[in-house]
Interface confidence: medium
């Protein structure tokens, strides 16, 4: 796995422990919490990041506090089970043997059950709508400049293939970024839209996951773009299933 050779750190994930114990003395980095080796040339999966966050000392957790809407699960943060690739396991359980099914971004999509609950597959979140409201500015941003800057950001900072940024909409003061990535479209090595959205969200909240970099300084033609509200709409390939009991709770 590539990492900064000079001081052996992981540029794309500061929640790692790195040491030159890889093959040939190469720098190898492992995610906190899971101990899984991570590829520092790309984004770390959201599952491993959440696991790392939960492993942080309680007093340190506030430093990486989730944004108000980071995990849009009513139950807030949880310590997730990740598969060998670092993806969320379809079934998640807590320490009291309460289980539920999640989607590919780790959001609960069924009622809670016991250990007998079956989650046959990890349902993919294939459409993410990121809704941002920016702070007042002297005038509206130029739409095409804004579009280009946000596409550049996702391409360069988050390494998301441009074809997965479906659209950037703007109507002052609201910006919407549409990310789309069906299972069939995602090739090996492609960054997952859920991971890119999570990194972006943390950046926007001033809680960057990147090692040693300054926070996100988003500018459109030199004008700072400061976000005051973030909402995320997650659309799954298969809609969530909740009982009517959940609806009336």
């Amino acid at each position: 796995h590539t990492a900064a050779q000079d001081n052996c750190t992981c540029p794309t994930n500061k929640m790692t422990v790195c040491s030159p114990d890889g093959p040939g003395g190469r720098c190898q980095c492992r995610a906190l919490g899971s101990g899984m080796a991570v590829d520092c040339s790309t984004l770390t999966s959201k599952c491993l990041l959440l696991k790392a966050r939960m492993s942080a000392p309680k007093n340190a957790r506030t430093l990486v506090r989730p944004s108000e809407h980071a995990l849009v699960d009513n139950d807030g943060l949880y310590d997730p089970d990740c598969d060998p690739e670092g993806r969320f396991k379809a079934r998640q359980c807590n320490q009291t043997s309460v289980c539920w099914c999640v989607n590919s971004v780790g959001v609960r999509r069924t009622d809670k059950g016991d250990l007998s609950l079956r989650c046959d597959e990890l349902v993919r979140t294939h459409h993410i709508l990121i809704d941002l409201r920016h702070r007042p500015t002297a005038g509206a941003f130029n739409h095409s400049d804004l579009d280009a800057e946000l596409r550049r950001l996702f391409r360069e900072r988050y390494r998301l293939h441009p074809k997965f940024v479906a659209a950037v909409h703007y109507e002052q003061p609201t910006i919407q970024i549409e990310l789309r990535q069906n299972t069939s479209q995602k090739a090996a090595g492609d960054v997952d839209i859920g991971d890119a959205a999570y990194y972006f969200e943390r950046d926007i909240k001033g809680e960057s996951l990147f090692q040693g970099r300054g926070g996100l300084d988003l500018r459109v033609r030199g004008e700072p773009l400061q976000v005051e509200r973030t909402l995320i709409y997650y659309l799954d390939e298969i809609p969530p299933k909740f009982s009517m009991k959940r609806l009336t709770a």
């Epitope: 479906a166 919407q176 909402l231």
Partner: antibody, heavy 121, light 111 residues
């Protein structure tokens, strides 16, 4: 003037199929969020399906796998293909459009008059 | 059975002010998703009354207002008129269900 006209509602046997149409005028369905919302007799509103300007679609859990929303840009129309119909699918089906903003705001500003689907056993 | 809870009915005399509540959860209103209100007169299609919590589409009189706080939203109607007799629905996005949801509706009667 923005207009939405639904058609295709009928009385159908349980397990049967129907295709509802929503014919749009005064705007292009290509650039708008078009939604189907239904209302069972004497009941409230229930969101059914949506097609985004980019063409992707999304369905409610209650109809997923049975209903399919689609659009025909040449006819400036949106459709709801309904299969494996059940009694609880009975109701008035409305076609609705957003405000026309390039943003998805989650509200439905323009509505058709509705078309009635009755599923009998 | 609705994700958003509304009182089944409210009433008021002409000229009075009434409010209709819409109670959700941290998965919808409480998460910051905008609330929209619809009016449905008997035998007609719904009509957008309030959008984005408190904005009125053109043509909607300022007698109608919207607000929200925490996990609830409220529709206010002042100067009640007999023509306001209708069913009123709130709607928003629910992130747990990944769906657009409506309240069960409130029947307004003008006495």
């Amino acid at each position: 003037e923005v207009q939405l006209v639904e058609s295709g509602g009928a009385l159908v046997q349980r397990g049967g199929s129907l295709r509802l149409s929503c014919s749009a005028s005064g705007f292009s369905v290509r650039n708008n969020y078009i939604t189907w919302v239904r209302q069972a007799p004497g009941k409230g509103l229930e969101w059914v399906a949506i097609v985004f300007p980019g063409g992707s679609s999304y369905h409610a859990d209650s109809v997923k796998g049975r209903f399919t929303i689609s659009r025909d840009l040449s006819k400036n129309s949106v459709y709801l293909e309904m299969n494996s119909l059940r009694e609880d699918d009975t109701g008035v089906y409305f076609c609705a459009r957003d405000s026309g903003s390039p943003l998805w705001r989650g509200h439905f500003q323009y509505w058709g008059q509705g078309t009635t689907v009755t599923v009998s056993s | 059975q609705s994700v958003l809870t509304q009182p089944p009915s409210v009433s008021g005399a002409p000229g009075q002010r009434v409010t209709i509540s819409c109670t959700g959860s941290s998965a919808n209103i409480g998460a910051g998703y905008d609330v929209h209100w619809y009016q449905q007169l008997p035998g007609t299609a719904p009509k957008l009354l309030i959008y984005d919590n408190n904005k009125r589409p053109s043509g909607i009189p300022d007698r109608f207002s919207g607000s929200n706080s925490g996990t609830s939203a409220t529709l206010g109607i002042t100067g009640l008129q007999t023509g306001d007799e209708a069913d009123y629905y709130c709607g928003t996005w629910d992130t747990s269900l990944s769906a657009w949801v409506f309240g069960g509706g409130t029947r307004l009667t003008v006495l």
